[in-house]
Interface confidence: medium
Amino acid sequence: SVGDYNTSEQKQACKKHELYVSFRDLGWQDWIIAPEGYAAFYCDGECSFPLNAHMNATNHAIVQTLVHLMFPDHVPKPCCAPTKLNAISVLYFDDSSNVILKKYRNMVVRSCGCH
Amino acid sequence: SVGDYNTSEQKQACKKHELYVSFRDLGWQDWIIAPEGYAAFYCDGECSFPLNAHMNATNHAIVQTLVHLMFPDHVPKPCCAPTKLNAISVLYFDDSSNVILKKYRNMVVRSCGCH
């Protein structure tokens, strides 16, 4: 499944959503040998007052939420973004067609929060 | 000035915006002694393809941007969020009316990026 992005007006709270990324879909199959894709996940949802503890909100996000309540046309709500990311290992071709095994940082969402 | 949140359709790219937060506006003047407020800043703007180097995008954000191009109804663009935050020192009254000097982490946006 591509994902479950909620486009309706009444969006749910900030959380982690399923997302499998196929390297073939991205057109990267010519240089990535393995894996064929990976579970990347993504973050989406509202960061509305009050920010619950599970929303991993920073102090700044808490302040920004309060300012948004007072001045909604001037300051946006904080946004739902990854708070922790994991790496994946990839076998790929370099520019000289050598096969390289490399760890790519910050590829997989582990948790989401309001920032 | 409260901020310069752009609500028009054609939003500018993800960047740091001015925001001065008054503790009086937040209703915190009874327990925060000093300062009266602080320059908090906030992040806002589009994280659209292609993500430039100054957008401090994570690998995941780069992948998500490409997936959004293919499946815009299913996966959102990455969001513009703080990449670095600074602390501020605050003088305040605790529950026993003692005056406390405390450093509050993650209160000021230093830089923004696509996440």
Epitope: R24, Q29, D30, I33, A34, L91, F93, S97, N98, V99, I100, L101 | -
Partner: nanobody, 117 residues
């Protein structure tokens, strides 16, 4: 034309081991990667491992239990499967990616692995 022949499958008890081989013959341009896939009845094909000169990568479900290796002189790739579980039961296929190809252009016929509990 390139032929891939898998061997080494069979019936084994849970906790046991098997060693699969995949021998490539024919007009090979030089293989960049040999991958192992498996397909259990009624399930989608699952990537198991990819063996290259640059390193070997494993699927999460077999990491730490399966080991891939290759013998370039024999154009053969091996999959050593230890600590087998009933959920490893499947037909195992090998696939060859040659130099200049953007995917796996040759596939073997498969070898059955059955793990009983």
């Amino acid at each position: 034309e390139v032929q891939l022949v898998e061997s080494g499958g069979g019936l084994v008890q849970a906790g046991g081991s098997l060693r699969l081989s995949c021998a490539a013959s024919g007009s090979i341009r030089g293989f960049v990667a040999m991958a192992w896939y498996r397909q259990a009845p009624g399930k989608q094909r699952e990537w198991v491992a990819t063996v290259t000169n640059g390193g070997t990568l494993y699927g999460d479900s077999v990491k730490g239990r399966f080991t891939g290796s290759r013998d370039n002189a024999k154009n053969t790739v091996y999959l050593q499967m230890n600590s087998l579980k009933p959920e490893d039961t499947a037909v195992y296929y090998c696939a060859l990616r040659q130099i200049g190809a953007s995917g796996y252009d040759y596939w073997g016929q498969g070898t059955q692995v059955t793990v009983s509990s």
